[in-house]
Interface confidence: low
């Protein structure tokens, strides 16, 4: 079953500044994201921001900036003028919707012992499901491996022999690349037919669009601009990682997320995918 992760991050530079990061671990396509605080929107929570692939974003105070980070993750920066932050013990919830019957919601908060500015993978909290723990363990190994690789590269740099240093690569980029397979693995674990939406195929096996082209939405033409729109979810500063129940719904029709410059919408997206696997048998 698709999962949503939520991470609350305290900025190292401003202790009263917070950012909420949310991601969807697939396999669906995102149509709408709602971020709320104090609980789920409509169940005691207050809406902070809504992000739509085509129609853009809107936010309400104390939200400062909501943006897409990748095709399956978003971030929301929060304003906080007070020295003693009201966000410290607040629950933040993210709801990813994929109409007509896909909507998943999870919540998270800043851990009590927050040490801002640390670059480390999200820490699994106790409620993390056992089947995901193994995957996260694997991602830990991958992270360690990448760290070790980086160490070797740095050692190589200090030798008189010709250097083999990759251009534009830093430890954070390596970490991000190491983290991405973990997400893909989690999605595949829950749905044997899962494909993380890098191909942006409109896998609408249960729907039909007026123009007959596999329900390609009108809002499939926009991609978040800037460096944040990378294909892998970046590693975020230490915070909570919450993988709660699969929110409200499972999808019966999916649509591609925003696509844009440098990203191609593949014309033949009706490849060998099992209908059962996509829509219900999990």
């Amino acid at each position: 079953t698709p999962e949503v992760w939520v991470q609350v991050q305290m900025e190292a530079t401003e202790l009263s500044s917070f950012t909420v990061h949310c991601g969807f671990l697939g396999p669906g396509s995102i149509s709408l994201v709602t971020v709320s605080w104090g609980g789920p929107d409509g169940a005691g929570g207050t809406k902070l921001a809504v992000l739509h692939p085509e129609l853009g974003t809107r936010q309400w105070a104390p939200a400062r900036q909501a943006r897409w980070e990748t095709q399956s993750s978003i971030s929301l920066a929060l304003e906080d003028s007070g020295a003693s932050s009201p966000f410290a013990n607040t629950t933040f919830c993210c709801k990813f919707a994929s109409f007509p019957e896909g909507s998943w919601e999870s919540c998270g908060s800043l851990p009590p012992s927050s040490d801002p500015g640390l670059s480390a993978p999200p820490t699994p909290v106790p409620i993390l499901r056992a089947d995901l723990a193994g995957i996260l363990g694997l991602s830990g190994v991958l992270l360690f491996g990448c760290g070790y690789l980086l160490h070797l590269l740095r050692r190589q740099k200090h030798r008189p022999t010709p250097r083999l240093q990759p251009s534009h690569t830093n430890s954070q980029a390596l970490t991000a690349q190491a983290w991405a397979p973990s997400q893909a693995s989690q999605a595949a674990l829950h749905d044997p037919y899962a494909t993380i939406n890098t191909s942006f195929c409109p896998a609408t096996l249960d729907t039909a669009h007026p123009n007959g082209w596999a329900s390609l939405p009108t809002h499939a033409a926009h991609q978040p601009q800037g460096p944040a729109a990378s294909a892998s979810t970046p590693i975020l500063a230490r915070g909570s990682f919450v993988s709660v129940e699969n929110g409200l719904y499972t999808q019966a029709g999916e649509r591609p997320p925003h696509t844009g410059p440098g990203l191609t919408l593949f014309p033949d997206c009706r490849g060998p995918r099992a209908v059962e696997g996509r829509f219900g048998v999990r």
Epitope: S103, N246, G247
Partner: antibody, heavy 115, light 107 residues
Framework: EVQLVESGGGLVKPGGSLRLSCAAS????????LSWVRQAPGKGLEWVSE????????YYPDTVTGRFTISRDNAKNTLYLQMSSLRAEDTAVYYC????????WGQGTLVTVSS | DIQMTQSPSSLSASVGDRVTITCKAS??????VAWYQQKPGKAPKLLIY???YRFTGVPSRFSGSGSGTDFTLTISSLQPEDFATYYC?????????FGGGTKVEIK
């Protein structure tokens, strides 16, 4: 084939209680969110409550908050609506529905609140 | 709560006619609007979701359009089986709210 079958409707006095059930089949019940929607005789549709796939999240409109409780038993593939402090204006056909929006509906069960 | 105002409340049309039903939301719901068809004594059926996407098995003569606060359901060529009541619904946020309905009758 997706099937939703409601039961438990009937005649009840104002202030009374009633528990509706919705038996589901033809899909993986535990993977889907479910709702109750009602329709008073000759009137339009009104959403009554919603529950997430595992039962963690529940939602209600103000008109029924505190009086109605939605729940589910994923082992039995059954959705419930416990209604208490019933009023005459709660008289309606109650449908259970799957999804967001409501892709599949049951046939409905009539609840009549009258003295 | 978001109010959905549907118009007209009823209309008379003939087989083959083009029929348009409108729905206005009290606030911006982006594209999160669905349309249902209901016949007497039967449960509603989902026709359109997210403004313009036809649900499983829905004929191509049904189409939806709009964005923000104004939405339209169009039946391009009315068929005998299309005489029913149609409802719009916003699925943008809870509480879910429906329009008052439009009854399409035979002229």
């Amino acid at each position: 084939e997706v099937q939703l079958v409601e039961s438990g409707g009937g005649l009840v006095k104002p202030g009374g209680s009633l528990r509706l059930s919705c038996a589901a089949s033809g899909f993986t019940f535990s993977s889907y969110g479910l709702s109750w929607v009602r329709q008073a005789p000759g009137k339009g549709l009104e959403w009554v409550s919603e529950i997430s796939s595992g039962g963690t999240y529940t939602y209600y409109p103000d008109t029924v908050t505190g009086r109605f409780t939605i729940s589910r038993d994923n082992a039995k593939n059954t959705l419930y609506l416990q209604m208490s402090s019933l009023r005459a204006e709660d008289t309606a056909v109650y449908y259970c529905a799957r999804g967001d929006p409501f892709g599949y509906w049951g046939q409905g069960t009539l609840v009549t609140v009258s003295s | 709560d978001i109010q959905m105002t549907q118009s007209p409340s009823s209309l008379s049309a003939s087989v083959g006619d083009r029929v348009t039903i409108t729905c206005k939301a009290s606030q911006d719901v982006m594209t999160a609007v669905a349309w249902y068809q209901q016949k007497p004594g039967k449960a509603p059926k989902l026709l359109i979701y997210s403004t313009s996407y036809r649900f499983t098995g829905v004929p191509s003569r049904f189409s939806g359009s709009g964005s923000g606060t104004d939405f339209t359901l169009t039946i391009s060529s009315l068929q005998p089986e299309d005489f029913a009541t149609y409802y719009c619904q916003q699925h943008y946020s809870t509480p879910r709210t429906f329009g008052g309905g439009t009854k399409v009758e035979i002229k």
